[in-house]
């Protein structure tokens, strides 16, 4: 094209239907210039214009020759251009924001605009660029792209953005532009101009404010606070930590807290200070609810279901910000809610759910929700298998008879369809407790009854009970303990009896032992003693308890003595014992030694002994009749250990073994013995009977039995040169090689002659006795031998 001709042809479109082509006028042309524009492809079209632009329908593919003829006062000039779609720019119209609004409570901006899709017939992708600016200085804070599609009609679009800074803190501006991406368009695609700017600012409802107010935030998050103020803010603190101030418009300031720590239950103070004032807000930094843990649903009474759980990690949010729980049952659609101020402990939480008629299986979902999030746990339960019965109450015990009682208790709930397994704890004083299990049918009215037999009469029992369902889930807690004394029954056995003839042989003394509780079956009130021979039976007057001895004047004929114990219910079977003693001329006294606590006695089996054996014992130093205690053992026994709390070491006891045949007792063995031997308590008394120039004759006496404290096994006699009241060593002092010792093991020996001595010499003599329990104390004497003649 010639210089001074139209130039710089440029075509743009905003809808791909119409191209708007414009050019620059030749230099020097005035206002009154006309143009002829001709477009030529296979045909030619010409247009007369008075301006430097023309709107033409979009040309189909291919090259077009455009001729622009400029007609002006001083002649004309012509320019030729080749036009192709590739030379055309697609520039969308400048978009317009229809509405910009804000939710100050959440610091969220809401943007609304129209894509004006009706002017664009072709389906195209649109990229929108949204710009958020802050403060009067319009600092860019957010630039995002947003993709939509043009579909031939006007469509409203929405976009929202949550600001990191509360919207009250500063003015916020928003502007948008767009870019159309059309697959069928081969020309240049360009961004639209930016829309006119819209802004959001907060109209203060007081002179000063801190934002946000009472915000709940996740621990570890970042958060911005600001103080909207007309006076200069001097400092800002979170808790006790000073924060650097970020200056906004005017005197407004902000602080940014990064990685916020968990708050106390009262929240964390955020405080801004000015010269004259102090302003605060509170931030609650916590956690969303943890998944409820150990969710468990059970019932005490088949009327109400108790679902309990552990809340897991503490949220640190309390009061109105605490976790609320909703328990939903999906089969019925029913639900219950729990809203509580969270305690700082991991205690168990619970909700009560009313059971529904004819529903046994429940599908529970526990939803947990707080301002920071939600979580849930589920559980499917057959509630008849999850019965944790209440503690049995009104537990009572009533007598049936002396060996059976009736237990009754109250267990609230409607259990008509299930069975209970109840465990009864039975405790006798000073005895091992016994457990008995009973299965009973559940009832509607909550009252239960069971009979308990095989008890002992006149025994103090302590009962308690707990129950579970037969399909075991949990035992109930134990009921209160109930003490009960069973009623009396007749004594089940006669007393253990023995008899002794008095020392003058004229009276028979009958002894008996008190019946043990389990045989007395009640409080023994008295005893009946009777004496019978072939001819007659003679009864003594009733002997009141606690007397356990009776004396009858009898001749040496054969009598059977009968002892009966009586309580308030009746009499025991009689205990019988014969007065007759079968003689035994073949008796030797034996020695026995025990094992510290008791003494083991053994004997040979004797088939003639048909009733029993009796071992009686007494302290051998006591006068006749000698009786301390006795023990009966069965006739098939060949040994027994005799133990008694009264046995003492070093005391000699007499033991007598009697065998019983044809109701008469025969003394089989007579023994003396010790439970434990000790050393003698005294030394033997000794004297010098005779002295010569080379010998001394010593004589000693027996030690009394009480002072021997064991069986005498011998004497130790020590002698050696030594003088009374001198510094020369005594006989028993160690290291003396000239001391001689004689061990006398013949305990019948009572004298000793010491020979081969030196004349007119002082000798120190010492005598000691010993038992298997040790050597007794010494007795000493100084003797001077006679002069050699």
């Amino acid at each position: 094209q010639k210089k001074g001709a139209p130039h710089d042809l440029k075509c743009v479109t905003n809808n791909l239907q119409v191209w708007n082509c414009s050019w620059k006028a030749p230099s020097g042309t005035g206002r009154g210039t006309d143009y002829e524009v001709c477009i030529e492809n296979r045909s030619r079209s010409c247009y007369q214009l008075e301006k430097t632009s023309i709107k033409i329908p979009a040309l189909s593919h291919g090259d077009y020759e455009i001729t622009i003829n400029s007609l002006h006062d001083f002649g004309s000039s012509t320019s030729k251009f080749t036009l192709n779609e590739q030379n055309v720019s697609l520039i969308p119209d400048t978009p317009e924001i229809l509405n910009l609004s804000a939710d100050f409570s959440t610091s969220t901006l809401y943007l609304k605009w129209n894509d004006r899709g009706s002017v664009f017939p072709h389906r195209s992708n649109v990229i929108w660029e949204i710009k958020v600016l802050r403060k009067e200085s319009m600092e860019l804070v957010k630039l995002v792209t947003h993709n939509t599609t043009l579909n031939g009609k006007d469509t409203l679009h929405h976009w929202s953005w949550a600001s990191d800074m509360p919207l009250e803190c500063a003015i916020h501006f928003v502007e948008i532009r767009c870019y159309i991406d059309n697959l069928h368009f081969s020309g240049l695609e360009e961004w639209s101009d930016w829309s006119p700017v819209k802004n959001i600012s907060w109209i203060p409802d007081s002179q000063t404010k801190v934002f946000p107010q009472d915000k709940v935030i996740l621990v570890g998050s970042d958060i911005t606070f600001c103080c909207v103020s007309q006076e200069k803010v001097l400092s800002a603190l979170i808790g006790h930590t000073n924060c650097p101030l970020i200056h906004l418009d005017g005197e407004n300031v902000a602080i940014k807290i990064r990685n916020i720590s968990v708050s106390a239950s009262s929240g964390t103070n955020v405080v801004f200070t000015t010269e004259d004032n102090i302003f605060g807000t509170v931030i609650f930094a916590g956690y969303p609810p943890d998944t409820p843990q150990q969710l468990n649903c059970e019932t005490h009474d088949l009327k109400e279901i108790i679902c309990s759980w552990n809340p897991g990690r503490v949220t640190a949010l309390v009061g109105p910000r605490a976790t609320s729980y909703t328990l939903v049952e999906s089969f019925s659609g029913k639900y219950v809610r729990l809203k509580r101020a969270e305690a700082p402990t991991n205690e168990s939480y619970q909700l009560l759910f009313q059971m529904l008629p004819n529903q046994e299986i429940y599908n529970f979902t526990l939803n947990a929700h707080n301002p920071l999030g939600r979580s849930q746990s589920t559980i499917l339960v057959n509630i008849t298998e999850k019965v944790y019965p209440h503690t049995p109450t009104s537990f009572k015990v009533k007598d049936i008879n002396s060996t059976a009682v009736k237990l009754s208790w109250h267990l609230p709930g409607n259990f008509a369809k299930i069975n209970f397994l109840c465990e009864i704890e039975i405790k006798k004083s000073n005895s091992v407790q016994e457990q008995r299990n009973v299965t009973i049918k559940g009832v509607e009215n909550s009252s239960y009854l069971v009979a308990l037999d095989k008890l002992n009469p006149y025994t103090l029992y302590t009962f308690r009970i707990r129950c579970s369902t037969e399909t075991f889930w949990k035992w109930s807690k134990w009921s209160n303990k109930k003490q009960h004394l069973t009623t009396e029954a007749s004594p089940s056995k006669g007393p253990d009896t023995w008899r002794e003839w008095s020392s003058d042989g004229k009276n028979l003394i009958i002894y008996w032992k008190p019946l043990p509780i389990n045989e007395a079956n009640g409080k023994i009130l008295s005893y009946n003693v009777s004496c019978s021979s072939d001819e007659e039976t003679q009864s003594l007057s009733e002997i009141p308890d606690p007397q356990h001895k009776a004396e009858i004047r009898l001749d040496k004929n054969d009598y059977i003595i009968s002892v009966v114990a009586k309580n308030s219910v009746g009499s025991s079977p009689p205990s019988k014992i014969a007065s007759m003693e079968i003689p035994n001329d073949d008796l030797k006294i034996e020695q026995v030694v025990g094992m510290g606590k008791g003494i083991l006695l053994t004997w040979h089996y004797d088939p003639n002994m048909t009733c029993d054996y009796v071992i009686k014992w007494c302290n051998s130093s006591r006068s006749e009749p000698c009786l301390m205690d006795w023990r009966k053992v069965p006739s098939n026994s060949t040994e027994t250990v005799i133990e008694s709390d009264e046995f003492r070491p070093g005391i000699r006891y007499n033991f007598f073994l009697y065998g019983c045949r044809n109701q008469g007792y025969q003394l089989l063995r007579s023994m003396i013995g010790y439970i434990e031997e000790l050393a003698p308590i005294v030394a033997p008394n000794f004297t010098v009977e005779d002295t010569s120039a080379d010998s001394i004759l010593v004589k000693w006496e027996d030690i009394p039995v009480e002072e021997l404290r064991g069986f005498l096994r011998g004497y130790l006699f020590y002698f050696g040169k030594g003088e009374r009241d001198t510094s020369k060593m005594r006989v028993l002092e160690s290291g003396r090689s000239d001391i001689k010792v004689k061990n006398i093991t013949d305990i019948s020996q009572k004298t000793l002659r010491i020979a081969d001595l030196q004349g007119k010499t002082s000798y120190h003599l010492v005598l000691r006795a010993y038992t298997d329990g040790g050597v007794g104390p010494e007795k000493s004497m100084y003797v001077v031998t006679k002069e050699n003649s």
């Epitope: 801190v210 107010q213 929240g267 405080v271 004259d276």
Partner: antibody
């Protein structure tokens, strides 16, 4: 137990000065913010001034700003209120009060003294 | 400054009755910064409730607080003879800290 005892009240002429003291015991005085609150005869409560636990910041009600000064001596466990240019409308029972939270900066008042009466009259 | 209004000015009730006391703020305040006090004649005020709903140490559970924003309530579920007194609300979230004018609860 926590005790706050005010003293220094009395009758004073308008334009004159008065210094109130509050002796604290039974707690760590240096860890708590302290306030003065007053109550005119037969009227409600009016907050007067606050001083932070460490004495670093002091704030006043508009009605006393520039005339009253709050201070504290943590070594003596004592809070003070210096009242200058007294006016008839300053007549009230003056209470000292301890803030609830240890070391906190914004708290309600959990312990109060029994008060001391200030009468401004010519 | 934040102005607190309390209503009603006087509440005449019988022992055992329920008292509902209202406190309204001239602008929204953080519930964390609202307290209630009780004052009996000739005595210093006593802190009942802080942070709108938390009972102070030693305060019986018949006293409860609620509310947020600009409207707060103190409820006494069953009035005891010793509860007849004047009740003040207070905001302590921004200076000047302000008290309400008080509500007198007296015996009917």
């Amino acid at each position: 137990q926590v005790q706050l005892v005010e003293s220094g009240g009395g009758v004073v002429q308008p334009g004159r000065s008065l210094r109130l003291s509050c002796a604290a015991s039974g707690f760590t005085f240096s860890s708590y913010g302290m306030d003065w609150v007053r109550q005119a005869p037969g009227k409600g409560l009016e907050w007067v001034a606050v001083i932070w636990y460490d004495g670093s910041n002091k704030y006043y009600a508009d009605s006393v700003k520039g005339r009253f000064t709050i201070s504290r001596d943590n070594s003596k466990n004592t809070l003070y209120l210096q009242m200058n240019s007294l006016r008839a409308e300053d007549t009230a029972v003056y209470y000292c009060a301890r803030e609830l939270w240890f070391g906190e900066l914004l708290s309600p008042f959990d312990f109060w003294g029994q008060g001391t009466l200030v009468t401004v009259s010519s | 400054k934040i102005v607190l209004t309390q209503s009603p000015g006087t509440l005449s009730l019988s022992p055992g009755g329920r008292a509902t006391l209202s406190c309204r703020a001239s602008q929204s305040i953080s519930s964390s910064y609202l307290a209630w006090y009780q004052q009996k004649p000739g005595q210093a005020p006593r802190l009942l409730i802080y942070a709108a709903s938390n009972r102070a140490t030693g305060i019986p559970d018949r006293f409860s607080g609620s509310g947020s924003g600009t409207d707060f309530t103190l409820t006494i579920s069953r009035l005891e003879p010793e509860d007849f007194a004047v009740y003040y609300c207070q905001q302590y979230g921004s200076s000047p800290f302000t008290f309400g004018p008080g509500i007198k609860v007296d015996i009917k």
